[in-house]
Amino acid sequence: TPEVWVQVQMEATELSSFTVHCGFLGPGSISLVTVSWGGPDGAGGTKLAVLHPELGTRQWAPARQARWETQSSISLALEDSGASSPFANTTFCCKFASFPEGSWESCGSLPPSSDPGLSAPPTPVPILRADLAGILGLSGVLLFGCGYLLHLLRRQKHRPTPRLQPSHTNSQALTAQAWAPSQASQAALHDPYATINTSFCPATLDTAHPNGWASLPTHAAHQPQGPAASASTPILARGSFVSVENGLYTQAGERPPHTGPGLTLFPDCRGPRAVEGRFGVR
């Protein structure tokens, strides 16, 4: 059945900037997306943005930029002008309408830094890019090797030089492996029926937006599709919530908000599946 996920993210560069990401997992073409804060649209919430696949977008302060990320997900950038950050305690809701089948809505907020389920507050987490990690790792090994060689040459001039194998350990892989099990425990805590695949898959390169969100195919024409098998929910970033239709939130665990360019993690090795067969395209 259709599901809506919501993820609220504090920008790493500016603590006063927030981004709300929302996505729809379900059959049918999306006719309208409404983002509100303070509660659901039509139930006490205040509209921040409305995104229509054909007619464009409308937004209201403090929304800064609303845009489609894929044909089934959107992002909304918010500018927090106040000295104290009211967004930190605010609920953001996204409503996806698939006319006339129905409307589905879910809400989420930025998790407080005091949340015991989270290992760190929502501040920038230094994550090395794979290529930089490799270069730095190799440089470190070479430097260490040179120093070690000099040390050996000083002590024993006739001893043969040791052969060094540069390490290509991917720091992102280590991060993801360390993160995945906590995701499962988080999900179990919030939703005893959740089935989370914690197996680690290699990072999928060159399939992401610069902000680390999966790039899915978009097409020009509307092409309503029939229902298809449920796609696996992507592993989401910090503070994300997946709405499940048994009325529970499943917290999708934690991941550093920026994994660097070109890195997308999925709960299985197949990446984003069944997208074209599940959504009417924009």
Epitope: T1, P2, S31, D41, K95, F99, E101, G102, W104, S106
Partner: antibody, heavy 122, light 106 residues
Framework: EVQLVQSGAEVKKPGASVKVSCKAS????????IYWVRQAPGQGLEWMGT????????SYNQKFRGRVTMTRDTSTSTVYMELSSLRSEDTAVYYC???????????????WGQGTLVTVSS | QIVLTQSPATLSLSPGERATLSCSAG?????MHWFQQKPGQAPRLLIY???NLASGVPARFSGSGSGTDYTLTISSLEPEDFAVYYC?????????FGQGTKLEIK
């Protein structure tokens, strides 16, 4: 308090048209779609169509083959359902309902009008 | 269109008993909604998206199913539960309702 108030009972002759109104109050009119369902005496429910009150988009049950028209007036928060070329089998109670939004962790509620009996008789 | 067939057409039970109402779809649907209707009243949403209780619906009601077969269960009947129940699919246009199951007091 959310309310949908429908117009009164109608008696029509075959071939005529009927226009039933549904006035909404107690909520932001354009936030929810309105759909129409009819129920012939002693029979089950039949979906006639849905109107998106925000942009006037409509979706109709093809069974009515162009006989049904749904419109809305945002200034009065009213939705109208017009059925033309009436026949005796169109005798039924016509309900308008506010479509529900499936919102996780918030109450999911539907609201219905009281129904309008339309009798088609010569 | 997708035809929904409800069974039984009439179910005669006593208060306190368990009621099981079935809805079979002519082809696979994504989820099912259930409505309750009492004489002279408008229908009322009971269960949405197969298994979720609408606001104010007692916990004795539950829904389940997938594909073509869906079930509404009332664990222990109360006097106010005797009514007509309809299933509805919204997976395919036109949206269709089942013909209804009348739950009557035995």
């Amino acid at each position: 308090e959310v309310q949908l108030v429908q117009s009164g009972a109608e008696v029509k002759k075959p071939g005529a048209s009927v226009k039933v109104s549904c006035k909404a109050s107690g909520y932001t009119f354009t936030d929810y779609w309105i759909y129409w369902v009819r129920q012939a005496p002693g029979q089950g429910l039949e979906w006639m169509g849905t109107i998106d009150t925000s942009d006037h988009k409509t979706s109709y049950n093809q069974k009515f083959r162009g006989r049904v028209t749904m419109t809305r007036d945002t200034s009065t928060s009213t939705v109208y359902m017009e059925l033309s070329s009436l026949r005796s089998e169109d005798t039924a109670v016509y309900y308008c309902a506010r479509d529900f939004i499936i919102t996780v962790n918030y109450p999911v509620v539907d609201y219905w009008g009281q129904g309008t009996l339309v009798t088609v008789s010569s | 269109q997708i035809v929904l067939t409800q069974s039984p057409a009439t179910l005669s039970l006593s208060p306190g008993e368990r009621a099981t109402l079935s809805c079979s779809a002519g082809s696979s649907v994504n989820y099912m909604h259930w409505f309750q209707q009492k004489p002279g009243q408008a229908p009322r949403l009971l269960i949405y998206s197969t298994s979720n209780l609408a606001s104010g619906v007692p916990a004795r009601f539950s829904g389940s199913g997938s594909g073509t077969d869906y079930t509404l269960t009332i664990s222990s009947l109360e006097p106010e539960d005797f009514a007509v129940y309809y299933c509805q699919q919204r997976s395919s246009l036109p949206f269709t309702f089942g013909q209804g199951t009348k739950l009557e007091i035995k």
